[in-house]
Interface confidence: medium
Protein backbone atom coordinates (compact mmCIF):
# COMPACT_ATOMS: atom_id res chain seq x y z
CA UNK A 1 0.00 0.00 0.00
CA UNK A 2 3.04 2.29 -0.11
CA UNK A 3 3.69 4.67 -3.00
CA UNK A 4 6.87 4.90 -4.98
CA UNK A 5 8.23 7.82 -7.01
CA UNK A 6 6.41 11.13 -6.80
CA UNK A 7 4.21 12.18 -9.73
CA UNK A 8 5.38 15.16 -11.77
CA UNK A 9 3.16 18.08 -12.72
CA UNK A 10 3.93 20.85 -15.16
CA UNK A 11 5.67 23.82 -13.49
CA UNK A 12 5.10 22.27 -10.04
CA UNK A 13 7.91 21.45 -7.63
CA UNK A 14 7.52 19.02 -4.69
CA UNK A 15 8.50 20.50 -1.34
CA UNK A 16 10.50 18.79 1.37
CA UNK A 17 12.89 15.89 1.23
CA UNK A 18 12.43 13.40 -1.61
CA UNK A 19 12.05 9.75 -0.55
CA UNK A 20 12.13 6.41 -2.34
CA UNK A 21 8.99 5.15 -0.63
CA UNK A 22 6.00 7.00 0.83
CA UNK A 23 3.66 5.41 3.36
CA UNK A 24 -0.11 5.19 2.86
CA UNK A 25 -1.81 8.42 3.95
CA UNK A 26 1.36 10.46 3.51
CA UNK A 27 0.93 13.85 1.83
CA UNK A 28 3.36 15.82 -0.32
CA UNK A 29 2.86 19.52 -1.01
CA UNK A 30 3.91 21.14 -4.27
CA UNK A 31 4.84 24.72 -4.98
CA UNK A 32 4.77 26.48 -8.34
CA UNK A 33 7.73 27.66 -10.37
CA UNK A 34 8.38 31.40 -10.82
CA UNK A 35 5.59 33.16 -12.79
CA UNK A 36 3.11 30.40 -11.87
CA UNK A 37 0.44 30.20 -9.20
CA UNK A 38 -1.33 27.21 -7.70
CA UNK A 39 -4.89 26.72 -8.86
CA UNK A 40 -6.72 24.59 -6.27
CA UNK A 41 -5.20 22.03 -3.92
CA UNK A 42 -1.42 21.97 -3.70
CA UNK A 43 -0.89 18.46 -2.36
CA UNK A 44 -1.08 14.79 -3.33
CA UNK A 45 -1.86 11.88 -0.99
CA UNK A 46 -0.68 8.28 -1.12
CA UNK A 47 -3.74 5.99 -1.12
CA UNK A 48 -3.59 2.27 -1.99
CA UNK A 49 -0.21 2.54 -3.72
CA UNK A 50 -1.43 5.42 -5.90
CA UNK A 51 -1.14 9.17 -5.66
CA UNK A 52 -4.38 11.13 -5.59
CA UNK A 53 -4.65 14.85 -6.28
CA UNK A 54 -3.47 16.96 -9.15
CA UNK A 55 -1.77 20.28 -8.31
CA UNK A 56 -2.20 22.70 -11.22
CA UNK A 57 0.12 25.65 -11.76
CA UNK A 58 -1.12 28.41 -14.04
CA UNK A 59 0.91 31.18 -15.60
CA UNK A 60 0.11 34.47 -13.85
CA UNK A 61 2.85 36.54 -15.47
CA UNK A 62 2.36 39.53 -17.75
CA UNK A 63 4.20 40.78 -20.83
CA UNK A 64 4.28 44.16 -22.59
CA UNK A 65 3.07 46.78 -20.09
CA UNK A 66 0.31 49.01 -21.54
CA UNK A 67 1.37 51.86 -23.82
CA UNK A 68 0.51 55.26 -22.37
CA UNK A 69 0.29 58.20 -24.76
CA UNK A 70 2.80 60.95 -23.95
CA UNK A 71 4.50 58.82 -21.30
CA UNK A 72 7.48 56.54 -20.94
CA UNK A 73 8.33 53.71 -18.55
CA UNK A 74 10.92 54.50 -15.88
CA UNK A 75 11.12 51.04 -14.26
CA UNK A 76 13.46 48.39 -15.56
CA UNK A 77 11.97 46.62 -18.56
CA UNK A 78 11.52 42.85 -18.46
CA UNK A 79 10.49 40.28 -21.02
CA UNK A 80 8.12 38.75 -18.47
CA UNK A 81 6.69 40.26 -15.27
CA UNK A 82 5.64 38.11 -12.30
CA UNK A 83 2.25 38.75 -10.69
CA UNK A 84 2.62 41.61 -8.19
CA UNK A 85 5.39 43.34 -10.17
CA UNK A 86 4.80 47.05 -10.75
CA UNK A 87 5.83 49.25 -13.68
CA UNK A 88 6.14 53.00 -13.24
CA UNK A 89 5.39 55.67 -15.86
CA UNK A 90 6.43 59.28 -16.23
CA UNK A 91 4.71 61.84 -18.42
CA UNK A 92 6.64 63.73 -21.06
CA UNK A 93 6.75 67.47 -20.48
CA UNK A 94 4.39 69.41 -20.41
CA UNK A 95 1.92 66.60 -19.74
CA UNK A 96 0.57 65.92 -16.26
CA UNK A 97 -0.26 62.50 -14.86
CA UNK A 98 -3.77 61.49 -13.83
CA UNK A 99 -4.35 58.10 -12.30
CA UNK A 100 -1.98 55.64 -10.71
CA UNK A 101 1.66 56.25 -11.74
CA UNK A 102 2.19 52.50 -11.69
CA UNK A 103 0.50 49.53 -13.28
CA UNK A 104 0.67 46.15 -11.61
CA UNK A 105 0.66 42.65 -13.04
CA UNK A 106 -2.35 41.10 -11.34
CA UNK A 107 -2.64 37.36 -12.06
CA UNK A 108 -1.81 37.72 -15.74
CA UNK A 109 -3.46 41.07 -16.42
CA UNK A 110 -2.16 44.62 -16.12
CA UNK A 111 -4.09 47.04 -13.96
CA UNK A 112 -5.35 50.20 -15.65
CA UNK A 113 -2.60 52.62 -16.67
CA UNK A 114 -2.53 56.37 -15.95
CA UNK A 115 -3.21 59.10 -18.48
CA UNK A 116 -0.93 61.96 -19.37
CA UNK A 117 -2.97 65.09 -20.00
CA UNK A 118 -1.90 68.55 -21.06
CA UNK A 119 -2.55 70.75 -18.03
CA UNK A 120 -3.58 73.57 -20.38
CA UNK A 121 -6.36 71.34 -21.74
CA UNK A 122 -4.69 70.94 -25.13
CA UNK A 123 -4.47 67.54 -26.85
CA UNK A 124 -1.73 65.81 -28.77
CA UNK A 125 -2.28 64.12 -32.16
CA UNK A 126 -5.54 62.13 -32.43
CA UNK A 127 -5.14 58.42 -31.66
CA UNK A 128 -4.57 56.19 -34.72
CA UNK A 129 -7.25 53.61 -35.52
CA UNK A 130 -6.94 50.36 -37.44
CA UNK A 131 -8.08 50.58 -41.07
CA UNK A 132 -8.96 54.26 -40.81
CA UNK A 133 -7.50 57.78 -40.87
CA UNK A 134 -8.43 61.31 -39.87
CA UNK A 135 -9.82 63.41 -42.70
CA UNK A 136 -7.59 66.43 -41.97
CA UNK A 137 -3.84 66.91 -41.78
CA UNK A 138 -2.71 65.82 -38.27
CA UNK A 139 -1.32 68.54 -36.00
CA UNK A 140 1.03 68.08 -33.07
CA UNK A 141 -1.19 70.15 -30.74
CA UNK A 142 -4.95 70.74 -30.70
CA UNK A 143 -6.77 73.42 -28.75
CA UNK A 144 -9.42 72.47 -26.19
CA UNK A 145 -12.85 71.75 -27.77
CA UNK A 146 -11.34 71.22 -31.23
CA UNK A 147 -12.46 68.12 -33.10
CA UNK A 148 -11.38 65.88 -35.95
CA UNK A 149 -13.19 63.30 -38.06
CA UNK A 150 -12.20 59.80 -39.09
CA UNK A 151 -12.95 57.90 -42.25
CA UNK A 152 -12.53 54.20 -42.90
CA UNK A 153 -10.53 52.62 -45.67
CA UNK A 154 -12.39 50.98 -48.56
CA UNK A 155 -14.56 47.98 -47.61
CA UNK A 156 -14.49 48.92 -43.90
CA UNK A 157 -17.52 50.20 -41.99
CA UNK A 158 -17.33 52.88 -39.32
CA UNK A 159 -18.74 52.00 -35.90
CA UNK A 160 -19.21 54.75 -33.32
CA UNK A 161 -18.98 58.53 -33.65
CA UNK A 162 -16.75 59.57 -36.55
CA UNK A 163 -15.99 62.87 -34.78
CA UNK A 164 -13.81 63.04 -31.66
CA UNK A 165 -13.34 66.10 -29.46
CA UNK A 166 -10.46 67.37 -27.30
CA UNK A 167 -11.68 67.77 -23.71
CA UNK A 168 -9.46 68.35 -20.65
CA UNK A 169 -6.38 67.34 -22.59
CA UNK A 170 -7.92 64.04 -23.71
CA UNK A 171 -9.55 62.94 -26.94
CA UNK A 172 -13.00 61.39 -26.69
CA UNK A 173 -13.40 57.74 -27.73
CA UNK A 174 -12.45 57.22 -31.40
CA UNK A 175 -14.60 55.07 -33.71
CA UNK A 176 -13.67 51.62 -35.05
CA UNK A 177 -13.37 50.54 -38.66
CA UNK A 178 -14.84 47.05 -38.95
CA UNK A 179 -14.65 44.67 -41.86
CA UNK A 180 -18.22 44.00 -43.07
CA UNK A 181 -19.37 40.39 -42.87
CA UNK A 182 -19.12 38.66 -46.23
CA UNK A 183 -22.15 36.48 -46.96
Amino acid sequence: TDCLSLPSFENAIPMGEKKDVYKAGEQVTYTCATYYKMDGASNVTCINSRWTGRPTCRDTSCVNPPTVQNAYIVSRQMSKYPSGERVRYQCRSPYEMFGDEEVMCLNGNWTEPPQCKDSTGKCGPPPPIDNGDITSFPLSVYAPASSVEYQCQNLYQLEGNKRITCRNGQWSEPPKCLHPCVI
Epitope: E96, M97, D100, E101, L106, T111, P114, E173
Partner: antibody
Framework: QVQLQESGPGLVKPSQTLSLTCTVS????????VYWIRQHPGKGLEWIGV???????EFNPSLKSRVTISKDTSKNQVSLKLSSVTAADTAVYYC???????????WGQGTSVTVSS | DIQLTQSPSSLSASVGDRVTITCKAS?????LHWYQQKPGKAPKPLIY???NLASGVPSRFSGSGSGTDFTLTISSLQPEDFATYYC??????????FGAGTKLELK
Protein backbone atom coordinates in the same frame (compact mmCIF):
# COMPACT_ATOMS: atom_id res chain seq x y z
CA GLN B 1 2.82 47.52 8.37
CA VAL B 2 0.56 49.74 6.26
CA GLN B 3 -1.70 52.03 8.29
CA LEU B 4 -3.89 55.07 7.62
CA GLN B 5 -5.42 57.21 10.36
CA GLU B 6 -7.95 60.01 9.92
CA SER B 7 -8.10 62.90 12.38
CA GLY B 8 -9.98 66.17 12.73
CA PRO B 9 -12.80 67.85 14.62
CA GLY B 10 -15.86 65.73 15.23
CA LEU B 11 -18.17 68.76 15.15
CA VAL B 12 -18.30 71.48 12.49
CA LYS B 13 -20.74 74.40 12.26
CA PRO B 14 -22.86 74.86 9.12
CA SER B 15 -21.26 77.09 6.41
CA GLN B 16 -17.79 76.43 7.85
CA THR B 17 -14.98 74.38 6.29
CA LEU B 18 -14.44 70.81 7.36
CA SER B 19 -10.72 69.94 7.61
CA LEU B 20 -9.46 66.39 8.03
CA THR B 21 -5.99 64.83 7.95
CA CYS B 22 -5.01 61.32 6.95
CA THR B 23 -1.66 60.25 8.41
CA VAL B 24 -0.11 57.23 6.72
CA SER B 25 2.67 54.84 7.68
CA UNK B 26 4.24 51.76 6.12
CA UNK B 27 4.28 53.22 2.62
CA UNK B 28 5.26 56.40 0.81
CA UNK B 29 2.86 58.95 -0.65
CA UNK B 30 5.28 59.29 -3.57
CA UNK B 31 4.37 55.73 -4.58
CA UNK B 32 0.66 55.45 -3.84
CA UNK B 33 -2.48 57.48 -4.37
CA VAL B 34 -4.86 58.14 -1.46
CA TYR B 35 -8.66 58.36 -1.68
CA TRP B 36 -11.19 60.07 0.53
CA ILE B 37 -14.55 58.31 0.90
CA ARG B 38 -17.48 59.12 3.17
CA GLN B 39 -20.48 57.25 4.49
CA HIS B 40 -23.64 58.99 5.65
CA PRO B 41 -25.33 57.45 8.72
CA GLY B 42 -26.92 54.13 7.75
CA LYS B 43 -26.12 54.69 4.07
CA GLY B 44 -23.67 53.52 1.42
CA LEU B 45 -20.21 54.69 0.43
CA GLU B 46 -19.54 57.89 -1.52
CA TRP B 47 -16.24 58.74 -3.21
CA ILE B 48 -15.02 62.28 -2.49
CA GLY B 49 -11.73 62.46 -4.35
CA VAL B 50 -8.17 61.22 -4.73
CA UNK B 51 -4.65 62.62 -4.68
CA UNK B 52 -2.37 60.58 -6.92
CA UNK B 53 1.25 59.72 -6.20
CA UNK B 54 2.36 62.40 -8.67
CA UNK B 55 0.32 65.05 -6.81
CA UNK B 56 -2.58 65.50 -9.24
CA UNK B 57 -6.10 65.35 -7.83
CA GLU B 58 -9.52 64.21 -9.04
CA PHE B 59 -12.90 64.75 -7.43
CA ASN B 60 -16.46 63.52 -7.40
CA PRO B 61 -18.23 65.93 -9.81
CA SER B 62 -21.04 66.45 -7.28
CA LEU B 63 -18.57 67.77 -4.66
CA LYS B 64 -15.85 69.24 -6.87
CA SER B 65 -16.69 72.91 -6.25
CA ARG B 66 -16.28 72.49 -2.47
CA VAL B 67 -13.38 70.03 -2.16
CA THR B 68 -9.63 70.52 -1.84
CA ILE B 69 -7.25 67.58 -1.37
CA SER B 70 -3.53 68.08 -0.86
CA LYS B 71 -0.61 66.15 0.59
CA ASP B 72 2.59 66.74 2.48
CA THR B 73 4.86 63.85 1.52
CA SER B 74 7.51 64.71 4.12
CA LYS B 75 4.90 64.50 6.90
CA ASN B 76 3.16 61.44 5.39
CA GLN B 77 -0.12 63.35 5.48
CA VAL B 78 -3.03 63.88 3.12
CA SER B 79 -5.56 66.58 3.91
CA LEU B 80 -9.19 67.02 2.93
CA LYS B 81 -11.01 70.34 3.04
CA LEU B 82 -14.75 70.58 2.36
CA SER B 83 -16.15 74.11 2.34
CA SER B 84 -19.65 75.48 3.02
CA VAL B 85 -20.77 72.41 4.91
CA THR B 86 -24.39 71.60 5.74
CA ALA B 87 -26.08 68.88 7.78
CA ALA B 88 -25.96 66.72 4.63
CA ASP B 89 -22.16 66.49 5.07
CA THR B 90 -22.57 64.66 8.40
CA ALA B 91 -20.84 61.34 7.80
CA VAL B 92 -17.97 59.02 8.67
CA TYR B 93 -14.97 60.04 6.56
CA TYR B 94 -12.41 57.44 5.46
CA CYS B 95 -9.07 57.67 3.70
CA UNK B 96 -7.83 54.64 1.77
CA UNK B 97 -4.76 53.65 -0.23
CA UNK B 98 -4.92 52.97 -3.96
CA UNK B 99 -4.14 49.39 -4.92
CA UNK B 100 -4.39 49.59 -8.72
CA UNK B 101 -7.37 49.61 -11.09
CA UNK B 102 -8.88 52.29 -8.86
CA UNK B 103 -9.41 49.81 -6.02
CA UNK B 104 -8.52 50.38 -2.36
CA UNK B 105 -6.48 47.91 -0.35
CA UNK B 106 -5.95 49.58 3.05
CA TRP B 107 -8.46 51.85 4.82
CA GLY B 108 -8.32 54.08 7.86
CA GLN B 109 -10.73 53.30 10.69
CA GLY B 110 -12.81 56.36 9.80
CA THR B 111 -13.59 59.57 11.65
CA SER B 112 -17.12 60.71 12.43
CA VAL B 113 -18.02 64.31 11.56
CA THR B 114 -21.26 65.99 12.59
CA VAL B 115 -22.36 69.29 11.07
CA SER B 116 -24.52 71.14 13.55
CA SER B 117 -24.82 74.56 15.11
CA ASP C 1 -21.66 58.27 -15.50
CA ILE C 2 -21.90 54.57 -14.80
CA GLN C 3 -24.40 53.46 -12.13
CA LEU C 4 -24.00 50.21 -10.22
CA THR C 5 -27.15 48.39 -9.10
CA GLN C 6 -26.76 45.69 -6.48
CA SER C 7 -29.29 42.98 -5.87
CA PRO C 8 -30.73 41.96 -3.60
CA SER C 9 -30.49 44.95 -1.26
CA SER C 10 -30.79 42.57 1.69
CA LEU C 11 -30.57 38.83 2.02
CA SER C 12 -31.26 36.33 4.82
CA ALA C 13 -29.23 33.14 4.78
CA SER C 14 -27.99 30.37 7.08
CA VAL C 15 -24.50 29.16 7.91
CA GLY C 16 -23.39 26.74 5.21
CA ASP C 17 -25.57 28.29 2.49
CA ARG C 18 -24.25 29.24 -0.93
CA VAL C 19 -24.90 32.93 -1.49
CA THR C 20 -24.74 34.99 -4.68
CA ILE C 21 -24.85 38.80 -4.83
CA THR C 22 -25.09 40.55 -8.19
CA CYS C 23 -23.92 43.95 -9.37
CA LYS C 24 -25.22 45.34 -12.63
CA ALA C 25 -23.49 48.26 -14.37
CA SER C 26 -25.50 50.74 -16.45
CA UNK C 27 -23.00 50.26 -19.29
CA UNK C 28 -20.11 47.91 -19.96
CA UNK C 29 -17.14 48.07 -17.56
CA UNK C 30 -13.77 46.33 -17.56
CA UNK C 31 -13.21 45.85 -13.84
CA LEU C 32 -15.31 45.58 -10.74
CA HIS C 33 -14.16 45.37 -7.12
CA TRP C 34 -15.97 43.98 -4.05
CA TYR C 35 -15.72 45.05 -0.39
CA GLN C 36 -17.12 43.73 2.87
CA GLN C 37 -18.15 46.06 5.69
CA LYS C 38 -19.16 45.18 9.22
CA PRO C 39 -21.03 47.64 11.50
CA GLY C 40 -18.78 50.36 12.91
CA LYS C 41 -15.80 49.20 10.82
CA ALA C 42 -14.10 50.36 7.64
CA PRO C 43 -14.75 48.39 4.44
CA LYS C 44 -12.34 45.57 3.71
CA PRO C 45 -11.35 44.54 0.16
CA LEU C 46 -12.56 41.10 -0.91
CA ILE C 47 -12.06 40.87 -4.66
CA TYR C 48 -10.10 43.04 -7.08
CA UNK C 49 -10.71 43.34 -10.80
CA UNK C 50 -13.70 40.98 -10.97
CA UNK C 51 -12.09 37.73 -9.80
CA ASN C 52 -8.82 38.29 -7.91
CA LEU C 53 -9.02 37.45 -4.23
CA ALA C 54 -7.56 40.14 -1.94
CA SER C 55 -4.83 39.15 0.48
CA GLY C 56 -6.05 37.04 3.41
CA VAL C 57 -9.55 36.50 2.00
CA PRO C 58 -10.80 32.88 2.34
CA SER C 59 -11.23 30.87 -0.87
CA ARG C 60 -14.98 30.44 -0.23
CA PHE C 61 -15.31 33.95 -1.73
CA SER C 62 -15.18 34.21 -5.51
CA GLY C 63 -16.06 36.78 -8.13
CA SER C 64 -17.02 36.51 -11.76
CA GLY C 65 -18.67 38.40 -14.60
CA SER C 66 -17.96 40.70 -17.49
CA GLY C 67 -19.52 43.59 -19.37
CA THR C 68 -22.45 44.74 -17.27
CA ASP C 69 -23.15 41.72 -15.05
CA PHE C 70 -20.95 40.70 -12.13
CA THR C 71 -21.41 38.35 -9.19
CA LEU C 72 -19.89 37.76 -5.78
CA THR C 73 -20.35 34.20 -4.51
CA ILE C 74 -19.80 32.78 -1.03
CA SER C 75 -19.70 29.01 -1.45
CA SER C 76 -20.42 28.08 2.17
CA LEU C 77 -21.49 30.89 4.45
CA GLN C 78 -19.62 31.23 7.76
CA PRO C 79 -20.77 33.18 10.86
CA GLU C 80 -18.17 35.92 10.21
CA ASP C 81 -19.54 36.53 6.69
CA PHE C 82 -22.68 38.33 7.87
CA ALA C 83 -22.01 41.92 6.78
CA THR C 84 -22.79 44.44 4.05
CA TYR C 85 -21.16 43.94 0.64
CA TYR C 86 -20.40 46.71 -1.86
CA CYS C 87 -19.32 46.58 -5.48
CA UNK C 88 -17.21 49.42 -6.87
CA UNK C 89 -16.07 50.64 -10.27
CA UNK C 90 -13.94 53.40 -11.67
CA UNK C 91 -12.39 54.01 -15.06
CA UNK C 92 -10.33 56.83 -16.44
CA UNK C 93 -13.44 58.33 -18.03
CA UNK C 94 -15.96 57.77 -15.21
CA UNK C 95 -16.06 58.86 -11.57
CA UNK C 96 -15.54 56.25 -8.89
CA UNK C 97 -18.87 54.78 -7.83
CA PHE C 98 -20.09 52.21 -5.34
CA GLY C 99 -23.20 50.06 -5.46
CA ALA C 100 -25.80 50.77 -2.77
CA GLY C 101 -24.79 47.65 -0.85
CA THR C 102 -26.25 44.25 -0.02
CA LYS C 103 -26.89 43.48 3.65
CA LEU C 104 -26.38 39.79 4.41
CA GLU C 105 -28.25 38.75 7.56
CA LEU C 106 -28.63 35.54 9.55
CA LYS C 107 -31.88 33.74 8.80
Amino acid sequence: QVQLQESGPGLVKPSQTLSLTCTVSGFSLTNYGVYWIRQHPGKGLEWIGVVWSGGTTEFNPSLKSRVTISKDTSKNQVSLKLSSVTAADTAVYYCARNFGNYAMDYWGQGTSVTVSS
Amino acid sequence: DIQLTQSPSSLSASVGDRVTITCKASSSVTYLHWYQQKPGKAPKPLIYATSNLASGVPSRFSGSGSGTDFTLTISSLQPEDFATYYCQHRSSSNPLTFGAGTKLELK
